[in-house]
């Protein structure tokens, strides 16, 4: 028998520095977690203690904090090289700055293979990107070889900006021939490493003949065997065992997100490359693991540019941006409109001639807007200003919901109206009318939504049975502020870009902004 240790991360999302327990900015260092300096310590300990170790990343290193905003992927290449990753799969967020924003900072600089079998380049891009990412890589480990085959969510064109010269194929269809090729090369130990979410990971384990282990990402899935060490609730045991269609037991793993855990899986193979046993658990990277001081010093050196960036002007406002709780928790506020407009703008994807865009709607809890911005400071807007408006380090995500769920959400928005509670929704691509004289749960008297399958966008009544795409904060997607119906009834959820980054990009693009209160939210006569 031959034993392999797989160390894995996924959805790190630019958390290069240690974070608080909820993966936001570290405040009390003695209780902080993760970060590349701490990860390095643990990885080095394991590499020294065990003979056959692979360090893998399942995508979405890009996007999530000011680190990515400023360094645009150079930070990912630098610190992943320092940690000596063995391979990485492309995630959807690796395309957030277009293909060039992937090629130059990451693909050309990484000292490790970057993989995806289901992304095919065409046209002029094919020769430019050739060899910079691979469908698979055979890695010698000790006296054996291990094949790593990559995959990426086929929804990436809807979630990011890969452009028109990359085709995202069905994962299973694309993986099978590559695995078959590895088999013909006498590679009998094969890891599928990719970024399509836990459901697809399990399908790959079930359907792709020859895959021995699946290391996934995208869905931020936390798996654990035994008592979990922090706040995350396990979605199943680690590893999660799937019985393949040809009768094999295939371990599937994922390691939550944000670099909080290091996935640790030990696999025992027989001489024919069959998995005999698999066991392990994610390792919580808490303060009991010291940060490597040299990596920490390097982080601090890179940090300097971030501090400078946060005070630079992004653009100007010529109007007061009303982000006060007195406005945003009671009525339409122009800060809410600005943020929702930025959220929609960030998700413009012309992927189908029938649709002007794939999504037109935005909802945003008023309680998530934490500060106004005064235009009387020469109109200047900085990252620092936006960090006061959106201090929680969240993301603006894409969900699919039925009309009936949206209706419930808007009823919840005003079910206890008047108490300055955070659930009051700001909107984009939606016209809502409330009648507060009616009883809670029956206060939405009009709900019109902007069409997507149209050449001239217009507002049509919401249809209860229709499925709609909506951009919203991850906080709402996870049922925050009492929006349990969103969490319980959503049909799809893809995590998006860092909230501040979305708004800052929009402001930089627009240069001068002047959002108005324009009648997106109304109250019927006599009730307000």
């Amino acid at each position: 028998a031959w034993e392999l240790t797989i160390l894995h991360t996924n959805d790190v999302h630019s958390r290069l520095e240690q974070t608080s327990e909820d993966s936001s900015k570290c405040v009390n260092a003695s209780r902080c977690m993760g970060g590349v300096a701490r990860l390095f310590t643990k990885v080095q300990q394991i590499r020294r203690a065990e003979p056959n170790v692979l360090l893998l990343d399942a995508g979405d290193q890009y996007q999530g904090t000011i680190w990515f905003t400023v360094y645009k992927g150079a930070e990912v290449a630098h610190f992943m090289n320092a940690l000596r990753y063995d391979a990485m799969a492309l995630g959807n967020h690796e395309f957030d700055n277009g293909v060039e924003g992937l090629i130059e900072p990451l693909l050309k600089e990484a000292k490790f293979p970057i993989l995806s079998a289901n992304i095919k380049a065409k046209g002029p891009l094919a020769s430019q990107i050739s060899g910079l990412y691979l469908p698979y890589k055979v890695l010698p480990v000790g006296d054996e070889v291990v094949g790593i085959v990559g995959y990426t969510s086929k929804e990436t064109p809807f979630l990011s900006n890969p452009g028109t010269n990359l085709v995202f194929e069905d994962e299973i269809t694309a993986l099978q021939p590559e695995v078959d090729k590895l088999k013909t090369l006498n590679v009998n130990k094969i890891i599928a490493l990719g970024h399509s979410g836990f459901e697809m990971d399990k399908l790959i384990a079930q359907k792709v003949r020859g895959v021995d282990v699946v290391v996934g990402g995208h869905s931020n899935t936390f798996l654990y065997t035994g008592n979990p060490p922090s706040k995350e609730v396990p979605a199943g045991k680690y590893p999660f065992i799937v019985t393949s269609d040809d009768g094999r037991k295939v371990p599937v793993v994922q390691a939550y997100a944000f670099g909080k855990y290091l996935g640790y899986l030990k696999i025992e193979f027989d001489e024919r490359g069959n998995v005999i046993s698999s066991h392990g658990n994610p390792i919580l990277l808490n303060s009991s693991i010291p940060e490597d001081p040299s990596i920490k010093a390097d982080i601090n050196k890179w940090r300097i540019k971030l501090d400078n960036y946060s005070t630079q002007e992004l653009g100007k406002t010529i109007v007061y941006l009303d982000g006060s709780s007195q406005s945003c928790r009671f009525r339409e506020c122009n800060m809410g409109n600005l943020i929702c407009d930025a959220m929609i703008n960030n998700n413009l994807r012309h992927t189908d001639e029938m649709f002007w865009n794939h999504v037109s709607m935005c909802i945003l809890n008023g309680g998530g807007i934490r500060s106004p911005i005064d235009e009387r400071n020469n109109g200047t807007i900085t990252w620092e200003n936006l960090a006061a408006v959106l201090p929680f380090g969240g993301t603006f995500d894409l969900v699919q919901l039925k009309g009936s769920t949206l209706k419930k959400a808007f009823e919840h928005s005003v079910h206890r109206y008047g108490q300055s509670t955070g659930e009051f929704l700001q909107v984009g691509g939606i016209h809502v009318v409330y009648d507060l004289s009616r009883k809670p749960g029956d206060r939405v008297v009009k709900l019109d939504v902007l069409c997507t399958k149209c050449r001239v966008p217009s507002y049509d009544p919401l249809k209860m049975d229709e499925v709609y795409k909506v951009i919203l904060p991850n906080f709402l997607a996870n049922g925050g502020d009492g929006f349990q119906m969103i969490k319980d009834e959503l049909l799809r959820h893809d995590s998006g870009d860092q909230d501040i980054n979305v708004v800052s990009t929009y402001i930089s693009k627009m240069k001068v902004i002047y959002p108005a209160v324009e009648g997106r939210i109304k109250f019927s006569t006599g009730s307000h």
């Epitope: 390095f40 080095q44 300990q45 020294r48 090289n81 000596r84 000292k111 010698p140 010291p290 040299s294």
Partner: antibody
Framework: EVQLVESGGGLVQTGRSLRLSCAAS????????MHWVRQAPGKGLEWVSD????????GYADSVKGRFTISRDNAKNSLYLQMNSLRAEDTALYYC??????????????WGQGILVTVSS | DIQMTQSPSSLSASVGDRVTITCRAS??????LAWYQQKPEKAPKSLIY???SLQSGVPSRFSGSGSGTDFTLTISSLQPEDFATYYC?????????FGQGTRLEIK
Amino acid sequence: EVQLVESGGGLVQTGRSLRLSCAASGFTFDDYAMHWVRQAPGKGLEWVSDISWNSDIIGYADSVKGRFTISRDNAKNSLYLQMNSLRAEDTALYYCAKDIYGSGSSFFDYWGQGILVTVSS
Amino acid sequence: DIQMTQSPSSLSASVGDRVTITCRASQYISSWLAWYQQKPEKAPKSLIYAASSLQSGVPSRFSGSGSGTDFTLTISSLQPEDFATYYCQQYHSYPPTFGQGTRLEIK
């Protein structure tokens, strides 16, 4: 300017002990792993031992395991190599070298000038 | 342990020549290879790390390439101060191991 200065070498009889020291300056000593590398007369370089920044991770070449002990005193910016049961084949120039990382197992960006250890029978 | 084999063991060249030294690892080491220069009676000096990254202060006539198991150190135009012994070292797997050295002498 980074400086590594070895001391404690000399002529010693087989089976006896010797303790090498390395005084470091010009960098934050307790941020980095440190190594001992040796070079027998007219021969190539051979890695001997390393120690991580906080002494948590320590390793030895098979040829010295059980006989040599590496240690460090971060308060004194010093690295040590206690060499027991010395053999003729331990005769070499011993270099103290700085790793680029705290947890070690990397390459060496700065080296001392070396100290000669001669083991005679 | 991973064995590192350098070739040639020694070579003679003239000032201005382009010189290439190769290093082969007994196992895959990705890009985790360093090159050192050692002059007689002196300590080794770091030249290149991660197979191709130049250490700060090292002249640009030195370059490194390769990945996997085969690596090269190239000196594009030999200068008098470049006559020395050159060592490769892998740091992919523990313990770190060195090549036996390549002695570069004046023709």
